[in-house]
Each structure stands twice: as structure tokens, then as C-alpha cells.
Amino acid sequence: SERCDDWGLDTMRQIQVFEDEPARIKCPLFEHFLKFNYSTAHSAGLTLIWYWTRQDRDLEEPINFRLPENRISKEKDVLWFRPTLLNDTGNYTCMLRNTTYCSKVAFPLEVVQKDSCFNSPMKLPVHKLYIEYGIQRITCPNVDGYFPSSVKPTITWYMGCYKIQNFNNVIPEGMNLSFLIAFISNNGNYTCVVTYPENGRTFHLTRTLTVKVVGSPKNAVPPVIHSPNDHVVYEKEPGEELLIPCTVYFSFLMDSRNEVWWTIDGKKPDDIPIDVTINESISHSRTEDETRTQILSIKKVTSEDLKRSYVCHARSAKGEVAKAATVKQKVPAPRYTVEGGGGTGGLNDIFEAQKIEWHEGGGHHHHHHHHHH
């Protein structure tokens, strides 16, 4: 056969569906690869062809559209399973072609089993709710197109093995689950089961999502730099190691990028001709507020380095802040000698500057390591 534009196996669309449930799978060509839709292609005389490769096989084979009760069918750019079976798992290909044009893409379909409490290997979408924010809703996802609007399905909401019936602040309202006020205790997996009739048969759609209660925008503040601060002075002698932590608290903000960085004499450490290492660690609170710590380290500090300006900067969608560390060269204590043989030598106060270092530790989720010269 003549050449075909092959988009390969689109692993970005790892489609997972439950065993023994209906599944409608759109050909990804029109969604992600081509600049025209199915209707345009069809009216231009292009035909959509489906075939598949079974799991652990290399052989491409046509899809059997002549199964009892039309278990597998095609409608426009959608491949329908009514319902799926476990051995439908495999790589599916949709190919759009006529005598002069050909384009195809493959995608993996995994038919997944669940237990009586809806546990399964299915990857779950996460829905974030703001803590103590007022009424918020989650909606039973990915059920559009399964039944016409004239059909009134029954929807049952579960948390784990059990139906949600009298769950204080959580109220099932058809396709929606309303949280009158969300608390940390509302974290967890919620499942909607949609039951609808079709041609004398009853089908079930099971959809599980994870609810994560996060910090409210009402309480969000600009980044807060806990360290460096005015109470800590970094006094070093040349040759010693200089360690300065920059510890910043970020309120949870949806889709905000939190950044922390150091400047030395107004420049990025990359642009300074000294041997600087920066280690970053990140930890999260239960409501996904974030604490980032970047420890700036100079192994053998010089007297020149101790005269530089070290500034920690932080930025989020709420604003940008900066704080300079107080770095000083330790003054060596003067040496006093007793002159003459029997002199009494007066009482001398010897002040030694105190070395103060504060090191943020413990329980971090991520670690990054940067080395600058």
C-alpha cells in the first residue's frame, strides 16, 4: 500500500476503561493531529478505518464489528464498546484515507478491573477544593455522549465502599456532589456510578476521582521569607564554610509557579566567579502550602566573599519579596601579653563574635542540587 502519515503510538493518551462498562473512544487524529474535524474529512470523501493489535501480539487485525448485540461499533469518529471485555486491551489504530491521502495514529487502550469498593489500577484525576471556602462542587467526569439528554440516568455517589447518604457537609445532587464547606477530612476518593438504560439493557459508568482539600485563596499571602532574617548574623573567618539557608513559605495558589533564587552582588550565582553550591528542598503542608529552602554554600569563603551582598528572592502569583543575609568577617580576638616580670596586668574583656548558623532540616519531599562556578 502507498505511504501513510504515521503518527506512531500516542502514549500520551493512555486510555483506561473499566471492564464490563460502555466506553466511547474518539479517534485522536481529529483532536490532536489534524487541523480539520471528522465532518470535514467525511464530506471530503475520506474514510475512517479502525484496527487493533492485541496485548502481547504484533499482528494488526481488523476490529470485528459483527459481534452479538453490536458489542463493538463505530459511529462517526467514535469507537464504541457496549460493554468492554478484559481482552479488549491492546493498541488501537484509526486511519483516515482515500486514494490520495492517508494519516493514522495508534493509542493504547487498557481494560481495567475494579473491586467492590472501586479500587483499581486506574489513574485518578485530582480535584482540588478550597478549605472552608463555601459551597463547591465536583461533577461526575467523562459521561457526556453516553446517553441522549432524554434519558434520565440514576447517579449514586460513593466514598470508598459506601454510598454517601448522610455525610454532614457533603450532599449528592445528581451528577454533582456538593461540599457545603470543605475540610481536610473530606480528602479521599469519590466515585459516581451512573446507571442508564439502552435498548432494553442497563449499563453502568463508574468514575472515581480524588478530592484534595487545599489552602483557600482567601487566606493566600505573598511569599514569606523566614530566613535570612534580622536576628541571624553569619560571621565567618576566611577559609571556613559559609552556609546560608533561604527558607520561604508559599500559600497554596492554584496554578501558581513558586520560585526562590539567590543573588550575589545583584547577580545570579552562575555569573559570579566563585564556587557556590545551592541545594533546594521542598515540603508541603496538608493543604499544599509549600516551604522551599535553598541553602547557599561556599566551601572555603574568602574575605572578598564576606564583603558581598547575599540576597534571597521569592516570587509567586501573589507577589515578589527579597531579603538580604547579614554576612560579616569574624574579627580575630586581640592577643594580650603581660609586660615586665611581676606586673599585675589589668582585667581585659575579650569579646568573641558569636557564630550563628541556622539549618533547616527534616521531612522534605524533593531535593535538587545546583553547583555554580
Epitope: 469498593c117 479500587n119 454532614n168
Partner: antibody, heavy 119, light 107 residues
Framework: QVQLVQSGAEVKKPGSSVKVSCKAS????????ISWVRQAPGQGLEWMGG????????RYAQKFQGRVTITADESTSTAYMELSSLRSEDTAVYYC????????????WGQGTLVTVSS | EIVMTQSPATLSVSPGERATLSCRAS??????LAWYQQKPGQAPRLLIY???TRATGIPARFSGSGSGTEFTLTISSLQSEDFAVYYC?????????FGQGTKVEIK
């Protein structure tokens, strides 16, 4: 340390009801599920039903539907199983068992309550 | 409901020997199976869930395998405290159902 402590043995007449309690300690009562499982003398285990106190929700095995009622009192972290219209074949040890509302296996068990139905 | 059938009803084994217990489901339960141990006068104790995952504090000599309709509990080297009755439980479908049990006794 999770503990489930059940009420004491009961002797009941046929046709009457029995209510067995199960007091839970350790962990948040409302975030768990309590199942009831019975075992007739010399027999195997039989799941009767369960409750998720925090969700106000119960599930029952078809066999016991209409005859068993499972309730919970969150203020005292206690679950109850009431079985009505008792017959001699209901003579058994009744266990409560607890786990997460997400898991269908039973990790923590009470010591059991023997219910004897005899005229 | 799913019927769980265990075999043999009784297994006579000497201490230190291997014991293999079987559990069969009347229809596929995927890997949604648990094993429990029960000693006389005691409540059952969870050994295995997910067909092969050992519960907290369960010694490594206990192992579970299988999926679909055929499952096995293996005790690699029987200790005196392992002589008991063992039950399988499916939780793929409601109602959850148990096998009738296998008694492991000293030979």
C-alpha cells in the same frame, strides 16, 4: 493501637431480637467502616453487612436484608448490629471487624459475641 | 453471589514442612482476595490481601498467589503456631463471601 470491644454473650428466644455492640478505639471512628461477620458453631465465616459511620451509609448481604440493622453512634465510637426474628440457626459467634472505608478486607477484629437462640 | 471453595478441608502437615492451601472462586474475582487465619476461640486474623500482599506484621513464610478463579496460600515452613483454620474471602463483588475453611493440623 486499634481495638474493638464487643458486648457480652446473649441467650435469646426464637422470634425475639438481639443487639450486639462494638466499641472502637484508636483512629477516627468516622473515617472507618465496621463490618459484621458471623460464624455458626463449627462453620465458616459469613459477612452480614457493614456501616461507614461518617457517611451515614450501610450495606447488607441479601440474605440478611430486612432482618439485620447496623447502626453507629459517633459520639461513643460504637457500632451496633441488631438481628430480628431470631431462629435457632442464628446461633453463632458474631464478630465486628474494622478497616478503611476504601478496603474490603478486614484488618482488625473484635473478640466475638456468642448469641444462643434457644426456646 | 460468588461461591468460594477451599481444598482440602483438612491438611495434615509436620512442623517444618510446606503447606499449600487452595481457594477457587465460582467466577473471576481478579486479585480481590484475602486470606485469614483463625485459631480455636479466637477471632480471625488478616494474613494476605490483594491475593499476594502480606498484611502488617505477618511473617514472610506466608505467601499468596493466583488471580481470576484460582488462588493459593503457601506456608513455606510450618511453625507450631501456624496450626489453625484458614479462610479465603473475595471482595470483588457484593456480598463479600468466604470459603468454608481449610484446617491445617499436625501430622
Amino acid at each position: 493501637q486499634v481495638q474493638l470491644v464487643q458486648s457480652g454473650a446473649e441467650v435469646k428466644k426464637p422470634g425475639s431480637s438481639v443487639k450486639v455492640s462494638c466499641k472502637a478505639s484508636g483512629g477516627h471512628f468516622s473515617q472507618f467502616a465496621i463490618s459484621w461477620v458471623r460464624q455458626a458453631p463449627g462453620q465458616g465465616l459469613e459477612w452480614m453487612g457493614g456501616i461507614a459511620p461518617g457517611l451515614g451509609s450501610t450495606r447488607y448481604a441479601q440474605k440478611f436484608q430486612g432482618r439485620v440493622t447496623i447502626t453507629a453512634d459517633e459520639s461513643t465510637s460504637t457500632a451496633y448490629m441488631e438481628l430480628s426474628s431470631l431462629r435457632s440457626e442464628d446461633t453463632a459467634v458474631y464478630y465486628c471487624a474494622r478497616d478503611s472505608i476504601y478496603s474490603a478486607w478486614l484488618a482488625y477484629w473484635g473478640q466475638g459475641t456468642l448469641v444462643t437462640v434457644s426456646s | 453471589e460468588i461461591v468460594m471453595t477451599q481444598s482440602p478441608a483438612t491438611l495434615s502437615v509436620s512442623p517444618g514442612e510446606r503447606a499449600t492451601l487452595s481457594c477457587r472462586a465460582s467466577q473471576s474475582v481478579s486479585s480481590n482476595l484475602a486470606w485469614y487465619q483463625q485459631k480455636p476461640g479466637q477471632a480471625p486474623r488478616l494474613l494476605i490481601y490483594g491475593a499476594s500482599t502480606r498484611a502488617t506484621g505477618i511473617p514472610a513464610r506466608f505467601s499468596g498467589s493466583g488471580s481470576g478463579t484460582e488462588f493459593t496460600l503457601t506456608i513455606s515452613s510450618l511453625q507450631s503456631e501456624d496450626f489453625a483454620v484458614y479462610y479465603c474471602q473475595q471482595y470483588n463483588n457484593w456480598p463479600w463471601t468466604f470459603g468454608q475453611g481449610t484446617k491445617v493440623e499436625i501430622k
